[in-house]
């Protein structure tokens, strides 16, 4: 009879064990364990009748199709085998054990005692068959195994082979290289790769297989396993496989599909191809005169582009439009997109006008083409070129007039400063009891008239100022402060300010230049109570033309000490010139005591300590700050006075040979102008040089050379 056993382990004994087994007996034990296991069988006791080749009694161990062992006897001989310590292993999950005894037993034999157990199969070690083993990695576990893949691969649905996702490859460049996955390593199994070459219409794709070509094939059947197919429109080329690469393929199309198929077996290295776009050829090109074509090639094909450029000093001219370069392209029909343009010499055209300057052509016929030369010069002696520039400009290859230092910027003609058209005399009387100034002696002198119509009644007063440039007047802040009923500092409205330049006699303003104000700028820290920071600027509505009677004064260098004691300076003004007129009288009589003709005086700078002491001895708050200096004589008699306010106190600078504004008429008192030991107090301009340049919007370097030449 047959016994079915399905447990993972068990015991099998001969009938009647441990007693002797009966004669003429046959029992079969069929052991089945789950897949992934095999059966291990061993005997703890074995005692059967001996016979030649186990013909009488035996134990036979077999699988479905194979006898694994036949045992009999008590000990192993040449012709019979006992299990002893031997273990029988089934190859699969089934084992059949048959015990048989014949009709007669000469002795009593006790039979056998056997044990079996299910043991795990290590499929990863044991599977030799490529059809069953894992493609990349094998992982064993009790009762089974599973496969996995290297990075970039996907496990196929057969759970064994590793494929790649390669169905979405698009190539749009005009040349390229396409390979099988992992080339030159063996390509993955079970994969369907699709490569699309999609070029612009007008190109044709040429394919060429290179290097190794190794695709699994078959000796009789054409490419049954792995293959390449090339699809061009409706036409399919291939399949291709084996070790011989296809010949170069001219597809005559701009769109090509390459299909690569691999099955679940084989170890082949794959393939590599290069592709390149071909197009129609365009005619040969001739570069223009004075020009060149880049790139220079023997042949040009569809989509090739060339850049036409001209030699230095020439411009590309196309349809009357000048340009630096011009690009043309080889079209798909084999023609060029445009005709070759011409090269025309660069023309800088008429140079820009220079304010207060002249232009001279150095090249014959007043040529303005490439490499022509011009020279700018300033209207001397009233203007001088900034930084002593040569003024020479050359027509550049870019079509602009260029100077070695300034580039394309025009030079600047700066007003010459501190150089009167007539020399100032050494002997000078005073403004008080004064001396008339000759026209042109003080060309920087400005008369500032303020008519404040916002006041009730309207207010009118005047002061002096000094021309710093064609557009800016320097004066005292108190001249341009609204005459308010409190001590708040508010500038007068620019609409209420008129500036006269080149004025000599106030009765005759016909020869003078009068200008209105564009801006009135008081020093932000001007203090009405002590006149500290008594400095201001007026920007003129329009720059004034310079000439013998209108020229700027120079600003000093930045030096906190100011002018040295005892240095002599000149001051001019139209203020009170009659020593018998008192301050109170001028206040009450308005402008009637204005001097008709410009007066001037020569005054020495007073040591600061002496001036401070002279004012501290008076009643009232008369502080002389570090932003002020004094000038005048101890004995009096020569002084500036009311109406001279804001006028320039100028000192001749030996280094630059120019007149420099060191002070501005600010205040004095409380005694009458020209009184004994009443020094005139002046704003120390050298403390404000940076502020002045900042307001005028010019860097200091612009003017320093003017003073230090």
């Amino acid at each position: 009879h047959t016994v079915e056993l399905n447990n993972m382990f068990g015991q099998i004994q001969s009938p009647g064990y441990p007693d002797s087994y009966p004669s003429d007996s046959e029992v079969t034990w069929n052991i089945t364990v789950p897949d992934g296991f095999r059966i291990k069988l061993y005997f703890m006791h074995f005692n059967l009748e001996s016979s030649y080749l186990c013909e009488y009694d035996y134990v036979k161990v077999e699988t479905e199709d194979q006898v694994l062992a036949t045992f009999c006897g008590r000990e192993t001989t040449d012709t019979e085998q006992t299990p002893g310590q031997e273990v029988v292993l089934s190859p699969g999950s089934f084992m059949s054990i048959t015990f048989r005894s014949d009709f007669s037993n000469e002795e009593r034999f006790t039979g056998f005692d056997a044990h079996y157990m299910a043991v795990d199969v290590d499929e990863c070690k044991e599977r030799e068959d490529e059809e069953l083993s894992c493609d990349h990695y094998c992982h064993n576990y009790i009762g089974g195994y599973y496969c996995s893949c290297r990075f970039g691969y996907i496990l196929h649905t057969d759970n064994r082979t590793c494929r790649v996702e390669c169905s979405d490859n698009l190539f749009t460049q005009r040349t390229g290289v396409i390979t099988s996955p992992d080339f030159p390593n063996p390509y993955p199994k079970s994969s369907e790769c699709l490569y699309t070459i999609e070029l612009e219409e007008g190109f044709m794709v040429n394919l060429q297989f290179e290097d190794i070509f190794d695709i699994e094939d078959h000796p009789e059947v054409p490419c049954p396993y792995d293959y390449i197919k090339i699809k061009v429109g409706p036409k399919v080329l291939g399949p291709f496989c084996g070790e011989k690469a296809p010949e170069p393929i001219s597809t005559q199309s701009h769109s090509v599909l390459i299909l690569f198929h691999s099955d679940n077996s084989g170890e082949n290295r794959g393939w590599r191809l290069s592709y390149r776009a071909a197009g129609n050829e365009c005619p040969e090109l001739q570069p223009p005169v004075h020009g060149k074509i880049e790139p220079s090639q023997a042949k040009y094909f569809f989509k090739d582009q060339v850049l036409v450029s001209c030699d230095t000093g020439y411009k590309v001219l196309k349809d009357n439009v000048e340009m630096d370069t011009f690009q043309i392209e080889c079209l798909k029909d084999g023609t060029w997109s445009n005709k070759i343009p011409t090269c025309k010499i660069v023309d800088c055209r008429a140079p820009g006008e220079l304010e207060h300057g002249l232009i001279t052509f150095s090249t014959r016929n007043n040529l303005t083409t490439y490499k022509s030369e011009i020279k700018y010069s300033c209207q001397e002696p009233y203007y001088k070129m900034l930084n002593n520039n040569t003024g020479i400009y050359t027509c550049s290859a870019q079509g602009v007039w260029m100077n070695k230092v300034l580039g394309r910027s025009l030079p600047t003609c700066l007003p010459e400063c501190g150089q009167p058209s007539r020399s100032l005399p050494s002997l000078v009387k005073r403004i008080i009891g004064g001396r008339n100034a000759e026209p042109g002696l003080f060309p920087w002198q400005a008369l500032i008239v303020v008519e404040d119509t916002s006041r009730v009644p309207n207010d009118k007063w005047f002061g002096s100022g000094a021309l710093l440039s064609a557009s800016w007047i320097l004066t005292a802040a108190h001249v341009l402060r609204s005459q308010r009923r409190d001590t708040t500092v508010i500038p007068v409205s620019k609409e209420h300010v008129t500036v006269y330049l080149g004025l000599h006699d106030v009765r005759d303003k016909s020869g003078a230049v009068n200008s209105s104000a564009a801006r009135v700028v008081l020093h932000p820290d001007f203090n009405i109570q002590n006149y500290n920071h008594d400095i201001a600027l007026v920007q003129l509505q329009e720059p004034v033309p310079l000439g013998p009677h209108v020229m700027p004064v120079c600003l000093p260098r930045l030096e906190p000490e100011g002018p040295a004691p005892h240095m002599l300076g000149l001051v001019a003004g139209w203020g009170i010139s009659n020593p018998n007129v008192t301050v109170d009288e001028i206040i009450s009589s308005g402008t009637r005591t204005l001097s008709d003709v410009l007066q001037y005086v020569k005054l020495p700078v007073v040591p600061h300590a002496e001036c401070k002491t002279s004012y501290e001895s008076r009643s009232g708050n008369y502080s002389v700050t570090e932003n002020m200096f004094c000038a005048g004589y101890y004995e009096g008699g020569k002084d500036t006075c009311l109406g001279d306010s804001g006028g320039a106190f100028v000192i001749f600078d030996d280094l630059s040979q120019r007149w420099v504004v060191q002070g501005l008429v600010s205040w004095g008192g409380p005694e009458e102008c020209g009184s004994k030991q009443v020094y005139g107090v002046y704003t120390k301009v050298s403390n404000y040089v940076d502020w002045v340049w900042e307001q005028m919007g010019l860097p200091q370097s612009v003017v320093e050379p003017q003073v230090e030449r």
């Epitope: 009923r485 409190d486 001590t487 409205s493």
Partner: antibody, heavy 114, light 112 residues
Framework: QVQLVQSGAEVKKPGASVKVSCKAS????????INWVRQAPGQGLEWIGW????????KYNDKFKDRATLTVDTSSNTAYMELSSLRSEDTAVYYC???????WGQGTLVTVSS | DIVMTQSPDSLAVSLGERATINCKSS????????????LAWYQQKPGQPPKLLIY???TRESGVPDRFSGSGSGTDFTLTISSLQAEDVAVYYC????????FGQGTKVEIK
């Protein structure tokens, strides 16, 4: 002719803020300053502060500098005085004046009461 | 801060008589540079804003009758109404504008 027209009377609770406006016409608003002065019932005049519309410069009486804010809107030629953290003693008529006190607004009564 | 003190607090004057109001400042209001005293006088009638009469201590505002005059310098100033008229009944204030602004406490002028 020059006119300064102030906003209407206000009643406020202690701790609140009030903003009084002063609209100028008849002269160039940015060329002169605006002063603010107040007068408590039956009391004298007290200067609050000053603003110059051209550059927004301000000056304040120390007594008010933490609570008063003076501003201008040059597009509408209007000056504003805002007083915060009101208390009952801020009850007063508030005046604006311009062109150095030549012209005055009609006054705005601000009553602070709980 | 500059303190302004007016005297008397009130004043009763017959019509056509002279009225004098004094104002004293705690520091000088004379600016030595401009030679001006920064003091103004105002008149205020009930229910009206103040009206400027005098500035720079002695300069009359345009449109102000010449019976009003100002004098003084430094710290002591006077407003004089040379011949009191009925319409002059008001409170008069002095104000310094030398350093910010400060008003005096006011002087009430009535007809006797």
């Amino acid at each position: 002719q020059v006119q300064l027209v102030q906003s209407g009377a206000e009643v406020k609770k202690p701790g609140a803020s009030v903003k009084v406006s002063c609209k100028a016409s008849g002269y160039t608003f940015t060329t002169d300053d605006i002063n603010w002065v107040r007068q408590a019932p039956g009391q004298g005049l007290e200067w609050i502060g000053w603003i110059y519309p051209r550059d927004d410069r301000t000056k304040y009486n120390d007594k008010f500098k933490d609570r008063a804010t003076l501003t201008v809107d040059t597009s509408s030629n209007t000056a504003y005085m805002e007083l915060s953290s009101l208390r009952s003693e801020d009850t007063a008529v508030y005046y604006c004046s311009s062109l150095e006190d030549t012209y005055w607004g009609q006054g705005t009564l601000v009553t602070v009461s709980s | 801060d500059i303190v302004m003190t007016q005297s008397p607090d009130s004043l009763a004057v017959s019509l056509g008589e002279r009225a004098t109001i004094n104002c004293k400042s705690s520091q000088s209001l004379l600016a030595s540079r401009t030679r001006k005293n920064y003091l103004a006088w105002y008149q205020q009638k009930p229910g009206q804003p103040p009206k400027l009469l005098i500035y720079w201590a002695s300069t009359r505002e345009s449109g102000v009758p010449d019976r009003f005059s100002g004098s003084g310098s430094g710290t002591d100033f006077t407003l004089t109404i040379s011949s009191l008229q009925a319409e002059d009944v008001a409170v008069y204030y002095c104000k310094q504008s030398y350093n910010l602004y400060t008003f005096g406490q006011g002087t009430k002028v009535e007809i006797k």
